[in-house]
Interface confidence: low
């Protein structure tokens, strides 16, 4: 018997293995990031690997446990929140997910001064939202759609609202459509900077039509889930904003903030609230036809105990080529004078840039400019403004962090991240401590993600917070696919694409091609980020080429590309995927008889329309939880891009852009349609209607439903889904199992 070493040394290739589907489903190659929970200019909290809550002081280098894992375990806490006066911690347990951001939980208050849980006047359960005041240890919480206030954790609560009612009136929390499509938060209440006032939204859903679907569960009869959900053109929620003095809440009670007259004249939305000082607040409003936004700065009138929003402090933002803003209207970042602010909006050339507004928007001073876009303003201090953009080397799918010195004239700009780890890191975000004394940089790729801590004055790296060493070691013997990001120039349109190539890719050979598409307005798929996911496996193990293409309607490349799809969803997004496929075929290494497309949500819509385009390019494709008609989707999202489904507006295109209208064209492709029956977002109705149209047209197709699963198809459904899709693609591409 000859014993052979487990590794053959004559070829490094032989020691390497391809990714497996199991690797992906088990999350074997997932990465970690480190976001400090800042509690001062130089201190942050972090939950250690063994679940202790640890306070770190950057300047002294000291760290100590403020809350032990035993205390966390005693109430099965999965989250925590330290009061600003550091006397109390809330512990969150019994997490129960509702929609994308919302969940309910049980909350316990732990007194750090005596090491005991606060007894007496305990919080009710389950609570929909809870938060500390920014100073001290006041608590605001939402229970059964009403808002309550506690001056101290052990005090009895003061009830602020009384009209809260399930599915009818929401106080301090958003209804479904505001949560998903406008605020992107689970809360709709905001403390003033020193905790004097509490602002909150009231959403009245009384007249909104309800979506109802079955939840099968385990009982003899299914439950019916009812959600007030305004579809395109339907009655919308009615929103009001109130502010209450939390020091003397019973004195005058909640005061309503007036809506600007030009907004209130027709249907409108509230889009965000930003406190400037304890006695100045900034509200943003948006017309239902979402091309006019008004930013309104309001002041507290001590004599009247009311909020005054003078017209001279109303700033109008209007788009003439599309909708206002990008995905959302941007929010202002106020400077230290408490009246001027920085905001991102389109410049005269149609690129989103930072502007400084001192008195009127007409006199705004443009801070950044160029054929690239400013993406986020992180922090404004007395002398610096930190923002992210995709300027560097003209790659729209990158993000670098910049500092503009606003304290000196002329302002100077410095890229903080461009040259730090240039090959590894091209896509950053940042998290700043108070006054930007320190900040953390989180790099998402294209190399293995890394999080680092930096000095806010010098930008010097202080330490590595997380470098994913274990992941790096685990990947050493994995044959990862190659990735390239390039662009196609077609008819004056730039189509950026990411191509994921098999490890032993050979340009002289022919490979099956899978297009992965999302393509929704203001989205971006071609990004310089690290990922080991399903498509990595398909390239590594199954030898497919995968491509992602950012076509018209996608973000961060200027308004011409972004607003091209305005009022015409489902046209150019599809055209551009098809155009890219034709270009890929011209490259010579694609087997044009084996081309597939797949997408989820908006991507499911685009993949369905691409398959039904009649081009003959695609052999097969998959749509997961697709939109099939814009009349079935949420008003706030749909109308932003499509207008209203009325005869005098855009009904014709609503009707022309459905998947069902193209049922006949699915005859010559293999189509796999997948949807969760409890999808609160893109309702199962969408796929039910596609299936009905295909059956009526006598077109064969494959389908899979996931009982009681929502838009995310999580848990065991995920494993089943990817296994099922893998079999479908391998069969389509004639790959052996």
């Amino acid at each position: 018997i000859v014993l052979r070493p487990s590794r053959v040394h004559n070829s490094e290739e032989n020691t390497m293995r391809a990714l497996t589907l199991k690797d992906i489903l088990n999350g074997t190659f997932s990465y970690k990031t480190f976001f400090p929970n800042w509690i001062s200019g130089q201190e942050y909290l972090h939950q250690s690997a063994d679940n202790n809550i640890v306070l770190y002081n950057i300047e002294t280098g000291q760290s100590y446990t403020i809350l032990s894992n035993r205390t966390m375990k005693s109430v099965n806490a999965s989250n925590y929140g330290l009061s600003p006066d550091r006397q109390f911690v809330y512990l969150e347990s019994d997490y129960s997910k509702l929609w994308r951001y919302s969940y309910t939980a049980t909350y316990y208050i732990y007194d750090l001064s005596n090491g005991e849980f606060v007894r007496g006047n305990e919080l009710p359960r389950p609570i929909q939202y809870l938060c500390w005041s920014p100073v001290g240890s006041k608590l605001a919480y939402v229970y059964q759609n009403n808002i309550y206030l506690k001056q101290r954790p052990g005090d009895p609560p003061f009830q602020i609202t009384f009209n809260g009612r399930e599915n009818k009136i929401f106080n301090g929390i958003p209804d479904w459509v505001y949560e998903e499509e406008m605020l992107a938060t689970k809360y709709a209440l905001w403390w003033s900077p020193n905790g004097k006032f509490l602002a909150y939204a009231e959403f009245n859903d009384t007249d909104i039509p309800v979506i109802a679907y079955s939840y099968y569960g385990d009982e003899q009869y299914p439950r019916t889930i009812n959600i007030p959900y305004p579809k395109a053109g339907a009655k919308n929620p009615v929103v009001r904003i109130f502010i209450i003095d939390t020091t003397y809440p019973a004195y005058v009670g909640p005061q309503e903030v007036p809506v600007p007259a030009m907004i209130a004249s027709s249907d409108y939305y509230f889009s965000w609230l930003t406190w400037v000082t304890d006695e100045r607040v900034c509200l943003q409003w948006l017309k239902r036809v979402q091309n006019v936004s008004v930013l309104s700065i309001c002041d507290f009138r001590e004599d009247w105990q009311t909020w005054d929003c003078p017209k001279t402090q109303e700033h109008i933002e209007e788009s003439r080529t599309g909708w206002a803003g990008g995905f959302f209207v941007s929010t202002p970042v106020f400077s230290y004078d408490a009246i001027s602010y920085y905001k991102i909006f389109s410049d005269k050339d149609g690129y989103k840039h930072i502007h400084y507004i001192k008195d009127t928007v007409e006199n705004a001073i443009q801070i950044t400019s160029g054929k690239w876009e400013a993406i986020n303003i992180f922090r404004v201090t007395q002398d610096s403004l930190f923002y992210s953009s995709n300027e560097f080397e003209e790659y729209p799918g990158r993000r670098n962090i910049y500092r503009i010195s606003i304290g000196s004239y002329p302002p100077s700009k410095k890229c903080v991240t461009c040259h730090l780890r240039k090959e590894r890191c091209q896509y950053y975000t940042a998290s700043f401590s108070d006054y930007a004394k320190y900040y953390a940089l989180v790099c998402y790729g294209p190399g293995i993600p890394i999080s680092t801590l930096h000095d806010g004055r010098t930008d010097q790296e202080i330490k590595i917070l997380e470098e994913n060493k274990e992941l790096e070691n685990a990947l050493k013997n994995i044959q990862l696919p190659k990735e390239e990001i390039k662009k196609l120039e077609v008819d004056e349109i730039t189509l950026w694409y990411k191509m994921i190539l098999p490890p032993q890719f050979d340009r002289s050979k022919k490979y099956p091609l899978l297009i992965q598409v999302y393509g929704g307005p203001c989205s971006q798929s071609v990004r310089s980020v690290f990922a080991v996911n399903w498509i990595s496996y398909l390239a590594s193990k199954e030898g497919m080429v995968i491509a992602l293409v950012d076509g018209r309607g996608t973000a961060f490349q200027g308004d011409k590309l972004l607003y091209a799809v305005y009022r015409k969803l489902g046209v150019y997004e599809v055209e551009d995927q098809i155009t890219a496929v034709r270009k890929f075929i011209e490259m010579g290494f694609i087997d044009e008889k084996r081309i597939a497309i797949w997408g989820w949500s908006y991507g499911g819509y685009v993949s369905s329309l691409a398959l039904a385009s009649g081009t003959g390019l695609f052999k097969c494709g998959i749509a997961v939880a697709p939109v099939s008609s814009w009349e079935y989707y949420a008003s706030v999202y749909t109308e932003r891009f499509m207008g209203l489904p009325t005869k005098d507006d855009n009904l014709e295109h609503y009707k022309n852009s459905t998947v069902m209208a193209r049922a006949e064209y699915f005859r010559n492709v293999d189509y796999l349609l997948i949807h969760g029956t409890a999808d609160d977002n893109v309702h199962f109705q969408n796929s039910a209607q596609i299936a009905k149209a295909l059956v009526n047209a006598q077109v064969d197709f494959q389908a899979m439903w996931y009982s009681d699963q929502n838009h995310g198809l999580s848990g065991l459904s995920t494993n089943h889904l990817y296994t099922h899709m893998t079999h479908f693609l391998k069969q389509c591409f004639s790959l052996s199992d």
């Epitope: 788009s319 080529t321 389109s346 005269k348 928007v361």
Partner: nanobody, 118 residues
């Protein structure tokens, strides 16, 4: 480029009316929000009316609300300011202006004088 020429100014008694017109040339007119500004002697330029590109949205400061009306005719490339119940404090040079999509006014006319006096 957008060129703007105002007309219709003149002398009027308090309580009277005037209609200012602004003729625009240049191919991007219909994409521009438009505004009327005024500048009284020794004072800064003040926005008195604004209108969105479609005419669907208008804006007036409190000082002229209910008295002034802005309108536009995209086909004729004209913007109008109807001024009623004029007061002495409305005396100023009135300028027509064209903005970008966020109502930054970057094109200006030469101005027309309005004098309200008995």
């Amino acid at each position: 480029e957008v060129q703007l020429v105002e007309s219709g100014g003149g002398l009027v008694q308090p309580g009277g009316s005037l209609r200012l017109s602004c003729a625009a040339s240049g191919r991007t007119f219909s994409y521009n929000p438009m505004g009327w500004f005024r500048q009284a002697p020794g004072k800064g330029r003040e926005l008195v009316a604004a209108i969105s590109r479609t005419g669907g949205s208008t804006y007036y400061p409190d000082s002229v609300e209910g008295r002034f009306t802005i309108s536009r005719d995209n086909a004729k490339r004209m913007v109008y300011l109807q001024m009623n119940s004029l007061r002495a404090e409305d005396t100023a040079v009135y300028y027509c202006a064209a903005g970008t999509d966020t109502w930054h006014y970057n094109y200006w006319g030469q101005g027309t004088q309005v004098t309200v006096s008995s």
